[in-house]
């Protein structure tokens, strides 16, 4: 913490300008009025303050706004944003996409994923839902940031907005997030023809249930292995060899290359070796011929 001293008369600050870069930390603390700083935040980013000096300015704002900064200040934080912790950001109420854009630009190239995720969360809360304008801003200024949102926040995306989401925006989404987004995408693209539908739904298929994957296998979609590998393990395991062959089409030979990676490995273990042999790929590890499969989980559920 910066020690308290009184401000020398000749150092009194009446406006935020470049002369402040020559102030020592304790002089900034003593001489800069927090209310003046807040009122002239738009000037701060143009002044080449050191990181130590920025620490003092942040401390000033923290004292003035213990419950969180107002958006008029947040919008003009500039490089001062780099000093914010997720805990600081959690106190904010942000509704303006201009504020979001400004801070996303500042954070680019810095290790600030936790701060950015919290900021986006505050924007979604502030705006009430993840609307098209917010999604467009995220895809333009922060590809992949959509996946920093919790499944609960993503549930506020209207299906009509899903079309604005690009494949690369979903690259870092986990299974729980795709579980939320997939039904919305299915709804958004339901009126499209088979091939067009598959192109659109492909990035969301990590959230698809088995019955939807089975349905795709009847539509000659020729799913690539990259997409197949992103399917939920639970969605892949019940598929038969014939269904997987139909689903992958000419890409089925890729199973050989990926046979040691999940979910391919787990799926192989559930198939009869006889059935796997029909693919002619030399896949090994299936259930030997003549073995009886007892599904004990079904028996437990009945007892």
């Amino acid at each position: 913490d910066v020690e308290r001293t009184t401000c020398p008369p000749e150092k009194e600050v009446h406006e935020i300008d470049e002369s402040l870069i020559f102030y020592k930390k304790r002089e900034l603390e003593a001489c800069v009025d927090a209310a003046l700083l807040a009122a002239q935040m738009d000037r701060v980013d143009a002044i080449p303050f050191t990181y130590e000096q920025l620490d003092v300015l942040k401390h000033k704002l923290d004292e003035l706004y213990p419950q969180g900064y107002p958006e008029s200040v947040i919008r003009h934080l500039g490089h001062l944003f780099l000093k914010m912790s997720p805990e600081d950001i959690r106190k904010w109420n942000v509704t303006s996409l201009e504020t979001l854009k400004a801070l996303l630009k500042v954070s680019k190239g810095h290790e600030m994923s936790a701060q950015v995720a919290t900021l986006i969360d505050r924007v979604v809360v502030g705006r009430g839902q993840l609307d098209k304008d917010t999604v467009d801003t995220l895809t333009a200024f922060c590809p992949g940031c959509l996946c920093s949102l919790s499944p609960e926040r993503l549930s506020s995306v209207p299906p009509s907005v899903i079309g604005a989401v690009r494949p690369q925006d979903l690259d870092t989404c986990g299974p729980r997030q795709l579980d939320v987004l997939y039904p919305k995408a299915r709804l958004a693209f339901q009126n499209m023809s088979g091939s067009e539908y598959f192109v659109k739904i492909r990035p969301f298929l990590g959230g698809a249930p088995t019955e939807d994957v089975k349905a795709l296998s009847q539509q000659n979609v020729s799913m690539d292995l990259a997409t197949f590998m992103k399917l939920r393990r639970e969605a892949v395991l019940p598929l038969t060899v014939a269904e997987v062959q139909k689903l992958l089409g000419p890409h089925v030979e890729g199973l050989k290359v990926e046979e040691q990676h999940s979910p391919v490995r787990d799926w192989i273990l559930k198939q009869r070796q006889d059935d796997l042999d029909t693919l002619g790929l030399g896949l090994q590890g299936g259930i030997p011929n003549g073995y009886l499969i007892l599904d004990l989980s079904v028996r437990e559920a009945l007892s």
Epitope: D171, D224, M229, K230, L255, V257, H261
Partner: antibody, heavy 119, light 108 residues
Framework: EVQLVQSGAEVKKPGASVKVSCKAS????????MDWVRQAPGQGLEWMGD????????IYNQKFNGRVTMTEDKSTSTVYMELSSLRSEDTAVYYC????????????WGQGTTVTVSS | EIVLTQSPATLSLSPGERATLSCSAS???????LSWYQQKPGQSPRLLIY???NLASGIPARFSGSGSGTDYTLTISSLEPEDFAVYYC?????????FGGGTKVEIK
């Protein structure tokens, strides 16, 4: 432009560990596995293993089992290869190479990272 | 593991000549799962041919590949000065993936 950019050269003592990074750009990171291949001075190429960035799943060449660990960071499109208990015969150039999931050929390679193990 | 043996170890030829490089596998390789790479001194390897005979993007048509089972061939119909390098075959038909020991094509 598709690029794989690796971390700089390393000099390590026997018994130490080395962690090499490979940052991908210009393509959908999770549509390709990342494999690691090494080349000892004046020698041929040796496959070490791969990682699926989508699932984080790994396969290692048994020759390196227990010594090699591959990890990924989807947020930065970066893959890491750590080799532990280094010995002099681990002196080599280590390459990351992109492999489209479902194929086995490497269509883009990193520039290589020289690791020297010497006491 | 499948051992890939490349022959000859060194091939001394002049520009304009035809180069034939062999790759022999210790057990059968599915032809879809064999590729060839070129490596020049101080550079990373570069994909030339995949799935035995498919030319990779940007590779000139003077390169071609053929073969099946245990025997595979890379042919350069007419050597250009930039073709003098080391060539490796590679299989992913069986785990672990393996490379051949390489054939060095040098200027005679």
């Amino acid at each position: 432009e598709v690029q794989l950019v690796q971390s700089g050269a390393e000099v390590k003592k026997p018994g130490a560990s080395v962690k090499v990074s490979c940052k991908a750009s210009g393509y959908t990171f999770t549509d390709y596995n990342m494999d690691w291949v090494r080349q000892a001075p004046g020698q041929g190429l040796e496959w070490m293993g791969d990682i699926n960035p989508s699932t984080g799943g790994t396969i290692y060449n048994q020759k390196f089992n227990g010594r090699v660990t591959m990890t990924e960071d989807k947020s930065t499109s970066t893959v890491y290869m750590e080799l532990s208990s280094l010995r002099s015969e681990d002196t080599a150039v280590y390459y990351c190479a992109r492999r489209r999931i479902g194929t086995g050929y490497f269509d883009v390679w990193g520039q290589g990272t020289t690791v020297t193990v010497s006491s | 593991e499948i051992v890939l043996t490349q022959s000859p170890a060194t091939l001394s030829l002049s520009p304009g000549e035809r180069a034939t490089l062999s790759c022999s596998a210790s057990s059968s390789v599915i032809s879809s799962y064999l590729s060839w790479y070129q490596q020049k001194p101080g550079q990373s390897p570069r994909l030339l041919i995949y799935r035995t005979s498919n030319l990779a993007s940007g590779i000139p048509a003077r390169f071609s590949g053929s073969g099946s089972g245990t025997d595979y061939t890379l042919t350069i119909s007419s050597l250009e000065p930039e073709d003098f390098a080391v060539y490796y075959c590679h299989q992913w038909s069986s785990f672990p993936y393996t490379f051949g020991g390489g054939t060095k094509v040098e200027i005679k």
